[in-house]
Each structure stands twice: as structure tokens, then as C-alpha cells.
Amino acid sequence: MMTGTIETTGNISAKKGGSVILQCHLSSTMAQVTQVNWEQHDHSLLAIRNAELGWHIYPAFKDRVAPGPGLGLTLQSLTMNDTGEYFCTYHTYPDGTYRGRIFLEVLESSVAEHSARFQIP
């Protein structure tokens, strides 16, 4: 039975040209996290973080994505095209797969604030 819950940073906004941290957290389960996949709204992979083998950053993002903090991902040099949904997929044993959603809005305005609160989708 899957008892865990994915908490995410929810809906966040950040300034064009700036950076943002995409973060998910799995709680309420003793399951072992074997791998976390980060994907964009169009199903393109940004990164994979295997518990033992470390990070894999996809070549399309290698100049703009930094691993971490933790199992999260830092997206840099933001463009307007980065606006959209991002998904963290936690592969766990023995529970199976958990998925969290983050919506990022990239703003032209200099008043854009990066909210870092955690939300349960």
C-alpha cells in the first residue's frame, strides 16, 4: 500500500534571466527512494538522480540545470519558454512510483517573487 505523500514547492514564479529551485519531498513512508526523475510539461527529461549513481543531466539542459539541492533541481538563466509544469517522479521500493507537480511562471517583471512554500498537490 502506498502511504507516502509528495510535497512540492507548488506554484512558483521567478524572473526572466534568474534561477529557481524545483524541489519535491516524499514523506509519510519508509520506502527507499531509488531514483528521482525530473521532467518538463512536454514529457522531456531534464534530469535523473539515482540514489547510488548520482545525477544525469540531459544535454539539452546541461548548461542551465544544476543538480540539487538534495534531490531537487536548480534551473538557471530562465526564459519565458520555461513557463509551465514540471514533474518529479519518485521511484521507490517497495511502494512504487510517486509523482509531484510544480507550476513555474517566468515573469518579465522585476517584481517577480520566488515563493518557496511547500504544497501537497
Partner: antibody, heavy 119, light 107 residues
Framework: QVQLVQSGAEVKKPGASVKVSCKTS????????MHWVRQAPGQGLEWMGG????????TYNQKFQGRVTLTVDKSSSTAYMELSRLRSDDTVVYYC????????????WGQGTLVTVSS | DIVMTQSPDSLAVSLGERATINCKAS??????VAWYQQKPGQPPKLLIY???YRYTGVPDRFSGSGSGTDFTLTISSLQAEDVAVYYC?????????FGGGTKVEIK
């Protein structure tokens, strides 16, 4: 230049164990995970598992779980693969292979080690 | 485990002609696919990574495409030195798996 040099061919009896070494040079050994891939004669490739030399953390193909042990010796930049309870179908070539940095692709391979299991 | 099914098993192509190898994953692996070339008595060599990126030093006659479950390796103009076995490989989730291989020969 990067080199992965494996130990020589081995002949073992069923039920025995074999330990294959992979001595590396030309790169920072602890910064790249090392993997083992095997290939039966004239057959395809099979991933056995990988090890993070920095932490010693391992990930195994469940097919080999309990029979394979991956270790490293950081002082000599050498990786090891030990396979126990050998069977005749373990008569294959074993390769070590390192990953690219921050990418899950094998960019350098050892020359291969043939292990023959025969009574 | 994700099964990678390659087709055809073998392929005979005239020098200078196009060779096309297909790989089908049993489930969606996004673009987490590489292609390797293996010549007799040698270890495999990386050709294509992330489905479509050519590895350093690989001739531009080699190209890769696809995402999800269907992937293709194309040799646009076959050369004698391209005679080898080609393998696809997925790393979307462990255990990482390879296709059964496609042997490319000269017709």
C-alpha cells in the same frame, strides 16, 4: 589518456567464485561511477550493476542480486566485480565501463575478461 | 524490466546506401536511449546518446532519432568500416537494458 585494463581470462568450476579487476588511469577515479556489463559469446549486452567509487554505493541488476559484489580500491584506482555460485551460463565476457560525467552513458570500456565455467 | 526490441536482427546494405535500425522499448523511456557500435573482439563504442546527440568524434553519417518507445539509428551512407553489431540501450530506470543487437553487413 583514459584507460581501463582488466585482468586476464579465468577458468572456474561450477559453484566457485571469480573476481575480475579493472585498473583505471588517466582520469579522476572517484568522480565517475563504474559499471559492469557482460556478454555471452555471439550474444547481446547485459548490465550487471554499477558502483560509485566515492561512496562505495552500489546498484545491482536484480537478476544478479546476491551473487555479484562490486567493490573499489581507491588507492589503486581499481574496480572489482566478484561473481559467486558460478554456473555454466556465466561463461561470458565481462566488461567494466565508466560513465560520462553527469550522464548515464558509457564512454570508456575495458578490453573484456572471458570467464569460462566448466567442470 | 524494460525490454528493448531491435529490428531487424541483421541487415545487408550496399556501400554508400542508407542503413536504418529500429529499437522499440516496452514502455516509455522518454529520450533516455543510447546507441553503441561493437566490432568483433572489441568492446562497444558510444555513437549516439540521449536519442539524438552524436558523441564526440562520431562521423556525421550516424544519426539518431525518436522518443517515448520508438527509436531509430540511421547510417546515411554505409562505409566498409561500419560493419559491426549495433545496440540500443535505455537508462530511464534500472535495471538498464540493451537491445538484442543488429548486425550490419555489406551487400
Amino acid at each position: 589518456q583514459v584507460q581501463l585494463v582488466q585482468s586476464g581470462a579465468e577458468v572456474k568450476k561450477p559453484g566457485a567464485s571469480v573476481k575480475v579487476s579493472c585498473k583505471t588511469s588517466g582520469y579522476a577515479f572517484t568522480e565517475y561511477t563504474m559499471h559492469w556489463v557482460r556478454q555471452a559469446p555471439g550474444q547481446g549486452l547485459e548490465w550487471m550493476g554499477g558502483i560509485n567509487p566515492n561512496t562505495g554505493g552500489t546498484t545491482y541488476n536484480q537478476k544478479f542480486q546476491g551473487r555479484v559484489t562490486l567493490t573499489v580500491d581507491k588507492s589503486s584506482s581499481t574496480a572489482y566485480m566478484e561473481l559467486s555460485r558460478l554456473r555454466s551460463d556465466d561463461t561470458v565476457v565481462y566488461y567494466c565501463a565508466k560513465l560520462l560525467r553527469l550522464m548515464y552513458y558509457f564512454d570508456y570500456w575495458g578490453q573484456g575478461t572471458l570467464v569460462t565455467v566448466s567442470s | 524490466d524494460i525490454v528493448m526490441t531491435q529490428s531487424p536482427d541483421s541487415l545487408a546494405v550496399s556501400l554508400g546506401e542508407r542503413a536504418t535500425i529500429n529499437c522499440k522499448a516496452s514502455q516509455d523511456v522518454r529520450t533516455a536511449v543510447a546507441w553503441y557500435q561493437q566490432k568483433p573482439g572489441q568492446p562497444p563504442k558510444l555513437l549516439i546518446y540521449s536519442a539524438s546527440y552524436r558523441y564526440t568524434g562520431v562521423p556525421d553519417r550516424f544519426s539518431g532519432s525518436g522518443s517515448g518507445t520508438d527509436f531509430t539509428l540511421t547510417i546515411s551512407s554505409l562505409q566498409a568500416e561500419d560493419v559491426a553489431v549495433y545496440y540500443c540501450h535505455q537508462h530511464y530506470i534500472t535495471p538498464w537494458t540493451f537491445g538484442g543487437g543488429t548486425k550490419v553487413e555489406i551487400k
